[in-house]
């Protein structure tokens, strides 16, 4: 039974490779999937000597290890590309690295949007 999952309809979208892949660079993505399948948001990034380089953000298809995650938290120690997923609209706005070996928790906040 899937109890009380947060329904994901929209995610923050970002693509660092937007020019080559001919997509938008950033914005919102409306998630679409098959009936009876859950949807998630994700974020992926690199960490080069403490400098965070966003790779992609967007919608993620039904993946059991993403179920019931309210926050986007990556736990791998030192991957080439960090990955996290979560459930709930725009839950991938902030993302966190919480290494399994018990290192410091690092949360990445989106830059404040400039007033229009």
């Amino acid at each position: 039974s899937g109890r009380g999952e947060a329904e994901t309809r929209e995610c923050i979208y970002y693509n660092a490779n937007w020019e080559l892949e001919r997509t938008n660079q950033s914005g919102l993505e409306r998630c679409e999937g098959e009936q009876d399948k859950r949807l998630h948001c994700y974020a992926s990034w690199r960490n080069s000597s403490g400098t965070i380089e966003l790779v992609k953000k967007g919608c993620w298809l039904d993946d059991f290890n993403c179920y019931d995650r309210q926050e986007c938290v990556a736990t791998e120690e030192n991957p080439q590309v960090y990955f996290c997923c979560c459930e709930g609209n725009f839950c991938n706005e902030r993302f966190t690295h919480l290494p399994e070996a018990g290192g410091p928790e690092v949360t990445y906040e989106p830059p404040p949007t400039a007033p229009t």
Partner: antibody, heavy 118, light 111 residues
Framework: EVQLLESGGGLVQPGGSLRLSCAAS????????MSWVRQAPGKGLEWVSA????????YYTDSVKGRFTVSRDNSRNTLYLQMNSLRAEDTAVYYC???????????WGQGTLVTVSS | QTVVTQEPSFSVSPGGTVTLTCGFN?????????PSWYQQTPGQAPRTLIY???TRSSGVPDRFSGSILGNKAALTITGAQADDESDYYC??????????FGGGTKLTVLG
């Protein structure tokens, strides 16, 4: 090093109950979905049940629905499978497995044997 | 009820190439089912070989590769060795928490 250690198997009469445990170490248990998979003697692998990181979502194969209950205690790093109304066809080695992104089983325990016989 | 099908048995000569397949009764296998492959020798726990269609698990030699062939998932072993003689299982993730195993393929390495 990731370790999954199942226990609680044994011989039980038809209609009886058992509770299997899987003690996890070497990874952040509360951050991993988990699953139970079984293998009857001389047969193939069969997915039995899965539970999300919080325990809020649980799923079962049709043949065990209403008889088996999967649960987890994240403070004890332990996964459980409560098996009631056991039948001869539930006789199998039961494995616990860690579920990773892309919904695959990245680590397996060594298994515990459940025998249902009178 | 979803049934995932694999060849019951297969033989390969040492050094040869073999492709095992994994299909199901209600359509074509695609990457959205996250096909994964596992190797099991008698009396042992399964070992993860391939996940997400074609990604090798850590420590798995590059003789093992995964793909989609037509409407099925496939596991190819190139340069087969004696210790590749095992049972091989595919798993498809159907969504909504449900995983389905194939019936398994018993691979024999001749000679």
């Amino acid at each position: 090093e990731v370790q999954l250690l199942e226990s609680g198997g044994g011989l039980v009469q038809p209609g009886g109950s058992l509770r299997l445990s899987c003690a996890a170490s070497g990874f952040t248990f509360r951050n991993s979905a988990m699953s139970w998979v079984r293998q009857a003697p001389g047969k193939g692998l069969e997915w039995v049940s899965a539970i999300s990181v919080t325990g809020g979502s649980t799923y079962y194969t049709d043949s065990v629905k209403g008889r088996f209950t999967v649960s987890r205690d994240n403070s004890r790093n332990t996964l459980y499978l409560q098996m009631n109304s056991l039948r001869a066809e539930d006789t199998a080695v039961y494995y616990c497995a860690k579920v990773y992104y892309y919904s695959f089983f990245d680590y397996w325990g060594q298994g515990t044997l459940v025998t249902v016989s009178s | 009820q979803t049934v995932v099908t694999q060849e019951p048995s297969f033989s390969v000569s040492p050094g040869g190439t073999v492709t095992l397949t994994c299909g199901f009764n209600s359509g074509s296998v695609s990457t959205s089912y996250y096909p994964s492959w596992y190797q099991q020798t008698p009396g042992q726990a399964p070992r993860t070989l391939i996940y997400n269609t074609n990604t090798r698990s850590s420590g798995v030699p590059d003789r093992f590769s995964g793909s989609i062939l037509g409407n099925k998932a496939a596991l190819t072993i190139t340069g087969a060795q004696a210790d590749d003689e095992s049972d091989y299982y595919c798993v498809l993730y159907m969504g909504s928490g449900i995983h389905v195993f194939g019936g398994g393929t018993k691979l024999t390495v001749l000679g």
